[in-house]
């Protein structure tokens, strides 16, 4: 797995360099997670044809993966910094159960899956420090998450492969939207 941001050899070799600002650190963290997702998607898509045919292959999707909507204030039209930041943190917290599900779903990229999960936890901490209105952030219920995880893991192999693909695709889209929004803050 790649080295997490801020731990590469260049940082050791150049102690005189300006430390990253909070915004730069968040930006770098998201890009690091996106790189990890890319690697995981590569393994998933090489293993099956689900990446091309997921739309036609499904009649219904009840995964309830977090998604940016107009009302969340993260798009250019109707941009609202505080509302958007709450949405990003809430969405990442909701994704955590799905990232937990992804563990043990990869043969050659097991470390990469763990790195994506751990880096997301760090990203949430960075963002929580940035947020003023922490009370508006709802944390998912652990019992509900445990039940969801059981349901996901009980699915047949085909459904689990499709679920993996959909989680990675949605998480990538969510992070890309978050990155764009955070750059406006």
């Amino acid at each position: 797995a790649p080295v997490p941001p801020g731990e590469d050899s260049k940082d050791v070799a150049a102690p005189h360099r300006q430390p990253l600002t909070s915004s730069e650190r968040i930006d770098k963290q998201i890009r690091y997670i996106l790189d990890g997702i890319s690697a995981l998607r590569k393994e998933t898509c090489n293993k099956s044809n689900m990446c091309e045919s997921s739309k036609e292959a499904l009649a219904e999707n009840n995964l309830n993966l977090p998604k940016m909507a107009e009302k969340d204030g993260c798009f250019q039209s109707g941009f609202n910094e505080e509302t958007c930041l709450v949405k990003i943190i809430t969405g990442l917290l909701e994704f955590e159960v799905y990232l937990e599900y992804l563990q043990n779903r990869f043969e050659s990229s097991e470390e990469q899956a763990r790195a994506v999960q751990m880096s997301t936890k760090v990203l949430i901490q960075f963002l929580q420090k940035k947020a003023k209105n922490l009370d508006a952030i709802t944390t998912p219920d652990p019992t509900t998450n445990a039940s969801l995880l059981t349901k996901l893991q009980a699915q047949n192999q085909w459904l689990q492969d499709m679920t993996t693909h959909l989680i990675l695709r949605s998480f990538k889209e969510f992070l890309q939207s978050s990155l764009r929004a955070l750059r406006q803050m």
């Epitope: 292959a57 219904e60 999707n61 009840n62 995964l63 009980a154 699915q155 085909w158 459904l159 959909l166």
Partner: nanobody, 124 residues
């Protein structure tokens, strides 16, 4: 495990109707998505219709929309396929299938359980 017994097939004239049934044995029938597939001679098994176990929504292949109706009776552990305005190209073995999960697949590889199939022949 769930056992599926599909029935109701037969020979019918073009323009006629048939009602297929699929009886499921086993627990928690209402948690399963129920799906009808069909396979014509020399062709791949194709999706016909589905009744969601999560949302009670129904879904159809374009080729049967407006002619076929899928319904389920959770009290009787049974799913039905009402087929009207039948055409010779509807001739196939019809299979009932069941799958549990948060996704409802339209492909045969996604199913958990299968019935043995019931033959529908539509003559012109």
């Amino acid at each position: 495990a769930v056992q599926l017994v599909d029935s109701g097939g037969g020979l019918v004239q073009a323009g006629g109707s048939l009602r297929l049934s699929c009886a499921a044995s086993g627990r928690s029938f209402s948690n399963y998505h129920m799906v009808w597939f069909r396979q014509a001679p020399g062709k791949e098994r194709e999706f016909v219709a589905a009744a969601s176990g999560s949302t009670s929504s129904t879904y159809y292949a374009d080729s049967v929309k407006g002619r076929f109706t899928i319904s389920r009776d959770n009290a009787k552990n049974t799913v039905y396929l009402q087929m009207n305005s039948l055409k010779p190209e509807d001739t196939a073995v019809y299979y009932c299938a069941a799958v549990a999960g948060l996704l409802l697949p339209r492909v045969a590889e996604g199913m958990d359980y299968w019935g043995k199939g019931t033959l529908v022949t539509v003559s012109s």
